[in-house]
Structures are given as C-alpha cells and as structure tokens.
C-alpha cells in the first residue's frame, strides 16, 4: 500500500507512517514503527505538556514570584501550566500576568467604575452633576450630594465634583 | 530474542567513576527507550532515569542528577550508564530495562553489580 | 513524587492459601499506569502484571490484580512454592517513575 501522506487528528507522520501523539502531560521517548507503538514517559512533578504532542521535552511550570507581587491563582497539574494572580492591592501587568503593578487610584472628583481584580486596573469615572468623591480611593464611588431639602436645612454652599454641598438652617421670616 | 547483555560485576575505590554497559539484540535497539533503576537493599527500586535511544535525549530522576550520566552508541546497540564520585551508598546492582509502548519494563539485563569499598 | 507504599513487608503462606497484597500510592494514579514485579533471588525483576489487572505472558491465572485511584492490590488465588519471591508495585503515573518497597512472600 501507498505511505500516507497525511494522518489522523491526534497522530503524526514520520518515516512514512503515522504514529500516535503522546496524550497531554507525556512526552515523547520513541516514536513508532511498524511493529511497535510509540513510547511516552510522564512529565516531571513541576512540568507539564497541555496537547497531544511529540515533544522530547516538558514544559516547566510558570513560578509565581512573590517578589513580582505574584501568587498562585491555581496549580499546574502534568496537563496545564501554574495560573498566576497578583497579591491583594495588586493587578497584572499584562495577559500572561508575569509582574503585578499597585491598583490605581481614582482622584477627587473621580469615583470608582469598577474595583480592580488580580487581572485588572481600577476603572475611574468623573463624579456627575449631584455626585462628588473628595478622597483618593482605589475602592470609593462618587457619593451623591447631601439633600438639605429632606434635612430642612438650605444650600449654603453648593457642591461640586470634590465637595459635598454644605446645608444650613433656613433664613426665619421677620415678623 | 530479546535480550539486554549487561557488563560485569565492578569493584572500584570511592571518588572514583564508572560505565556501566547494556547492549540490546533480538530486535531494533532505536525503537525503544533505555531505562535504568538501581536495587539496594536499604531503598528497594530506584529509577534513575531514561534516555530516548532514537533522540539521544535523558530525563533523570531529580535525585540522580549530578550522579548518573546516560548515553548511547547506535552503532553498537548499547547504552551506558555512567556513575561519579562514588561512594559506599552507589554500591547496588544496577539494570537496564526497556519498555514496550504496551507495558512496562518488558525486558530486563541481568543487572550489574557494583561495589564501592576501599 | 507518588510514593507507593506496600504492605506487608513479608508474609509467609501454605501451599493452597489465598493471598493478598496492597499498595497504596501517596496520590492519586490511572489503573493504567500502576503495575506488579516479582523478583526472585539473583534474578532481575519480572514483569507479573500491567495496568492493573492484566497478565502478562505466560504469568498463571492464579494471579489477579485490582484496584483504582490510591489502593490496588495483588491477589494470588492459592499459593504454589514457586510464587515465594518478592513482589513490588510500580507506577508510570508521574515522572519520577516510583516502585514500592516490596513484599517478601515467603513458603511455611
């Protein structure tokens, strides 16, 4: 018969035959033949191959350095890579979360959108018209402004984006 | 027939080095992996690691790193184990084994000892 | 590492008794990477069992394996006076490849 040119998924050719891939979390030691299958060995305590493969090495896990400001999110098995996340306060510096920079604050004037995660920055938004924020926080939204109507009180002092409105007692009527 | 001729019995001074021999007949020596484990009698079977005959590539187990060396020579069908710095905890008997992609370690040399002593 | 851990150490059995060995591994192995060697004295191991339960060629019937996860065990339905020998359990789980300490099944 006519060597193959192509194989099936989860196989690959050499030598003119097509051998099976070493499954995920083995890696390669002899490929097959016509009387023998190929041969796989198991990837080290802190290795790892995630496809189906004919790899002559393992991957090494990724190492979440704490002097990065990196932990763990979840352990690397023989079959997937370590996930790591950032310390608390802290986000990653990009998608493959290899350093970890501070949370941004939000200015005054700005409240928090949305809390930072470990995978991403704080998101700030300008305090609108009735709202104000007079802190820099990385977890404070914009606060409305007091209702002097619902105290009794008037405006004395209006608001602004940083500054909560100051209330005070009504001017009486002079008889 | 399968078979995986060892070397014979070594006697050798502390600090020294050795290499051990395993030549396999009977079928096609690149098709398998050479594997090698020690027997002792304080830690029963140790793997000490594998090397790919076709690739030429070892993977050793962490604690033989530094100790143990695998080679081989296609031409000869032989594969070797090399031990450094010895000393009275490398006396053992050593064995090749290959496995089949089916099985385990199908076939066994008849294992070399070694004695470390001054 | 899997640290596969036998037990007994040594046994001794009459012909015609039924006997059982365990071995239990540190974490958790397919049933197809675990496997069983005898050894007799001066000779080198011999494959007895793989992936768990099944015979390797020529190996009797009186033997059986079993088992999944961390407990397998080897079972030799009754005891012939050339089954004295030792018996260790093997995974091919996870690198480095690991063997039990052994068990010494001894003739009375």
């Known amino acids: 018969p006519e060597p193959p040119t192509a194989c099936r998924e989860k196989q690959y050719l050499i030598n003119s035959q097509c051998c099976s891939l070493c499954q995920p979390g083995q890696k390669l030691v002899s490929d097959c033949t016509e009387f023998t299958e190929t041969e796989c060995l198991p990837c080290g305590e802190s290795e790892f191959l995630d496809t189906w493969n004919r790899e002559t090495h393992c991957h090494q896990h990724k190492y979440c350095d704490p002097n990065l400001g990196l932990r763990v999110q979840q352990k690397g098995t023989s079959e997937t890579d370590t996930i790591c996340t950032c310390e608390e306060g802290w986000h990653c510096t990009s998608e493959a979360c290899e350093s970890c920079v501070l949370h941004r604050s939000c200015s005054p004037g700005f409240g928090v959108k949305q809390i930072a995660t470990g995978v991403s920055d704080t998101i700030c938004e300008p305090c609108p018209v009735g709202f104000f924020s007079n802190v820099s926080s990385a977890f404070e939204k914009c606060h409305p402004w007091t209702s002097c109507e619902t105290k009794d009180l008037v405006v004395q002092q209006a608001g602004t984006n940083k500054t909560d409105v100051v209330c005070g007692p009504q001017d009486r009527l002079r008889a | 027939e399968v078979q995986l001729q060892q070397s014979g019995a070594e006697l050798v001074s502390p600090g020294v080095s050795v290499k051990i021999s395993c030549k396999g007949s009977?079928?096609?020596?690149?098709?398998?992996?050479m594997h090698w484990v020690k027997q002792s009698h304080a830690k029963s079977l140790e793997w000490i690691g594998v090397?790919?005959?076709?690739?030429?590539?070892?993977t050793y187990n962490q604690k033989f790193k530094g100790k143990a060396t695998l080679s081989v020579d296609k031409s000869s069908s032989t594969a070797y184990l090399e031990l450094a710095r010895l000393t009275s905890e490398d006396s053992a008997i050593y064995y090749c084994?290959?496995?089949?992609?089916?099985?385990?370690?199908?076939?066994w040399g008849q294992g070399t000892t070694l004695t470390v002593s001054s | 590492q899997i640290v596969l851990t036998q037990s007994p150490a040594i046994m001794s059995a009459s012909p015609g008794e039924k006997i059982t060995i365990t071995c239990s591994a540190s974490?958790?192995?397919?049933?197809?990477?675990l496997h069983w060697y005898q050894q007799k004295p001066g000779f080198s191991p011999k494959l007895l069992i793989y992936r768990t339960s099944n015979l390797a060629s020529g190996v009797p019937a009186r033997f059986s394996g079993s088992g999944s996860g961390t407990s397998y065990s080897l079972t030799i339905s009754s005891m012939e006076a050339e089954d004295a020998a030792t018996y260790y359990c093997?995974?091919?789980?996870?690198?480095?490849?690991?063997f039990g300490a052994g068990t010494k099944l001894e003739l009375k």
């Open positions: 093997h995974q091919y789980h996870r690198s480095p490849l690991t």
């Open positions: 090397i790919s005959t076709s690739y030429g590539v070892a």
């Open positions: 084994a290959r496995r089949d992609s089916k099985s385990p370690f199908d076939y």
């Open positions: 974490s958790s192995i397919s049933s197809n990477y």
């Open positions: 009977g079928y096609t020596f690149t098709d398998h992996g």
